[in-house]
Structure formats: structure tokens, C-alpha cells
Interface confidence: low
């Protein structure tokens, strides 16, 4: 069964910077990745980035850089300009549309106890099928 993992990392050097890593584990290959925060895409979440294998990437503030890491994982750098970071308690969701499986989404957040530079372990938390 395909899985999506989400990993949220606070940068040790800049406490206002976060990186979201997402990956797809399963057969097939990826046709689109959507990253949102505050909830799943289309279910209360706000789009942060869309990555298309051929057409490229598009991102919205506070997303700073969205990029492919491997053929089945992406990363999204976030920069918080405010004094207090809203990211610490925020849920980030990644939805992978893949052929021929359909769409799979998973969400994750920075653990409350995280120290700078530490990351949440990859978490294939509840997977939502959204064909």
C-alpha cells in the first residue's frame, strides 16, 4: 500500500526557518505534489506550494523554496518574518498524485519538544485516499 511521509524540521541556525520534507513510498510515479498548511488540501488547508514534474513549481508566502529532492520526495523551505513562529504548532500536509494509484495525502507537524536542528521522524500518519 502506498504511503506518504511528512517530516518538519526547524533549522538550527535560523529559528524562524523551517523545512517540510515529504515523500511518496509506493509503486507508480508522481504527477503532482501539493503542500498545504492548517489542514489537508481542499479541507481547510491553505496551499503553500505545488510541484509539477514537467511544468515546474509554484509557491506562496511564507514558502521560500519548493524543490524536488529525489524522484519521489520534495522539500519546502518556509521563512517566518514575524517575531513569534506560527509554524511550531502548525500542521503541514502533502498530497501526492501518482499514476496509477491515485492521490495520497499525509500530514505532520514539528513535535512540541523539538530542539532547533532536530526533526520529526518520517511519519506515515493517516493516509487519505482521494481519487
Amino acid at each position: 500500500t502506498p504511503e506518504v511521509w511528512v517530516q518538519v524540521q526547524m533549522e538550527a541556525t535560523e529559528l524562524s526557518s523551517f523545512t517540510v520534507h515529504c515523500g511518496f513510498l509506493g509503486p507508480g510515479s508522481i504527477s503532482l505534489v501539493t503542500v498545504s498548511w492548517g489542514g489537508p488540501d481542499g479541507a481547510g488547508g491553505t496551499k503553500l506550494a505545488v510541484l509539477h514534474p514537467e511544468l515546474g513549481t509554484r509557491q506562496w508566502a511564507p514558502a521560500r523554496q519548493a524543490r524536488w529532492e529525489t524522484q519521489s520526495s520534495i522539500s519546502l523551505a518556509l521563512e517566518d518574518s514575524g517575531a513569534s513562529s506560527p509554524f511550531a504548532n502548525t500542521t503541514f500536509c502533502c498530497k501526492f498524485a501518482s499514476f496509477p494509484e491515485g492521490s495520497w495525502e499525509s500530514c505532520g507537524s514539528l513535535p512540541p519538544s523539538s530542539d532547533p536542528g532536530l526533526s520529526a521522524p518520517p511519519t506515515p500518519v493517516p493516509i487519505l485516499r482521494a481519487d
Epitope: 515523500g23 511518496f24 513510498l25 509506493g26 509503486p27 510515479s29 508522481i30 504527477s31 514534474p53 514537467e54 524536488w68 529525489t70 524522484q71 519521489s72 520526495s73 499514476f99 496509477p100
Partner: antibody, heavy 122, light 107 residues
Framework: QIQLVQSGPELKKPGETVKISCKAS????????MSWVKQAPGKGLKWMGW????????TYADDFKGRFAFSLETSASNAYLQINNLKNEDTATYFC???????????????WGQGTTLTVSS | DIVLIQSPATLSVTPGDSVSLSCRAS??????LHWYQQKSHESPRLLIK???QSISGIPSRFSGGGSGTDFTLTVNSVETEDFGMYFC?????????FGGGTKLEIK
């Protein structure tokens, strides 16, 4: 430079097993998928399937489900094709081919191995 | 499975001529069509990706066109090193399929 180097020619009997290797160099192995393609003597090309070199998950074309297995040795940047219970019709040249990453359905083979000739004969 | 029909099966040309090779898909494949060259006893070489996108290191005399079901590979001013087999391949749906090939030979 980028290279895919395959193992040498094989002569096998029906019912035996063969394992063909494809060693990648010159790029990050886990960033690109690897496909396998069959070419029977004097014939065209037939896609056998591919393996995701990051997750290790293989996908097989219908005609290559059952006796065929793709595997990896990621630490050595090796991909393998194993064929069990060999049949005469398996006689062919087998190519490994690197897939351009992030193609919509993984399809563009930009670098190919030199091919491994397999002869199955009693 | 998507069937790719290449025509003609054989094309006899004189060096310096310009030629067009055809590849027709049995169903709509958008621009998910790639072209490869294969010389005798060698592995295939990617010439054009996604119907018309050029590949680094491939001479500019090779160009591709088409979309949907009909595609063309054009070789302008054919050189002796261009003779061999040419295959098209679709990646619109699994399994990936190749055309039967067009043999480009010296007249």
C-alpha cells in the same frame, strides 16, 4: 561522466536462473529511476518495467510479471534483473536505462547500458 | 496497450537529404512521445523528449513535432552517422510501448 555498465553475456539452459547487473556511475543513483528493456534478436524494444531507486519499489509490465524480478544494491549503485525458470523465448539483449527524474509517468530514458545478451538453449 | 505505428518501415536516403519519420499512436498521448536512435549492435540513444524537446549533445539537425496521436521526427541534411534504426516510445500510460522502428539506410 554518466555511465551504466552491464554484466557480460550469459549462456543458460531452460529452467535455470540468470541475474544481470547494471552498475551506475557519474550521478546520484537514488535520484533517477531505472527501467529494463528487452530486445529479442532482430526485433524492436519492449519495456519490462522499472524500479524506483529511492523506495526500492518495482513496477512490472504485464508480460513480465512472475518470473522477473528487479532489485537494487543501493550502496554500490547497482540495479539487477533476475529471470527465473528461463525459457527459449527469453533469448534477447536486455538493457538497463536511466529514467529522467520527475517525468509524469516516468518515461524518458536518457542513458542506457550497453546491453547484456542472454542466450537460452538446451 | 497503446500501439505506436512507425512509417515507413525503411527509408533510403542520400547524405544531405532531409527526411521525416512518422509515429502514430492508437490513442491520444498528448506530448508524451520520445524518439531514440539505435545503431547496429549499440544501445538506443535519446534524441528528442516530449515530442519536441531537444536533448543536450544531440545535433540540432534532429527535431521533433506533433501532439496527440501524430508525431514526426525530422532529420535535416542527413549525415552518414545518422543511419540506423529509429524508435518512438510513449510514456502517456503503462506499459510504455515502443514503435516497431524505422530503418534509415543509405540509398
Amino acid at each position: 561522466q554518466i555511465q551504466l555498465v552491464q554484466s557480460g553475456p550469459e549462456l543458460k539452459k531452460p529452467g535455470e536462473t540468470v541475474k544481470i547487473s547494471c552498475k551506475a556511475s557519474g550521478y546520484t543513483f537514488t535520484t533517477y529511476g531505472m527501467s529494463w528493456v528487452k530486445q529479442a534478436p532482430g526485433k524492436g524494444l519492449k519495456w519490462m518495467g522499472w524500479i524506483n531507486t529511492y523506495s526500492g519499489v518495482p513496477t512490472y509490465a504485464d508480460d513480465f510479471k512472475g518470473r522477473f524480478a528487479f532489485s537494487l544494491e543501493t550502496s554500490a549503485s547497482n540495479a539487477y534483473l533476475q529471470i527465473n525458470n528461463l525459457k527459449n523465448e527469453d533469448t534477447a539483449t536486455y538493457f538497463c536505462a536511466r529514467e529522467l527524474p520527475f517525468t509524469t509517468i516516468i518515461g524518458t530514458k536518457d542513458y542506457w547500458g550497453q546491453g547484456t545478451t542472454l542466450t537460452v538453449s538446451s | 496497450d497503446i500501439v505506436l505505428i512507425q512509417s515507413p518501415a525503411t527509408l533510403s536516403v542520400t547524405p544531405g537529404d532531409s527526411v521525416s519519420l512518422s509515429c502514430r499512436a492508437s490513442q491520444f498521448i498528448s506530448n508524451n512521445l520520445h524518439w531514440y536512435q539505435q545503431k547496429s549492435h549499440e544501445s538506443p540513444r535519446l534524441l528528442i523528449k516530449y515530442a519536441s524537446q531537444s536533448i543536450s549533445g544531440i545535433p540540432s539537425r534532429f527535431s521533433g513535432g506533433g501532439s496527440g496521436t501524430d508525431f514526426t521526427l525530422t532529420v535535416n541534411s542527413v549525415e552518414t552517422e545518422d543511419f540506423g534504426m529509429y524508435f518512438c516510445q510513449q510514456s502517456n500510460s503503462w506499459p510504455h510501448t515502443f514503435g516497431g522502428g524505422t530503418k534509415l539506410e543509405i540509398k
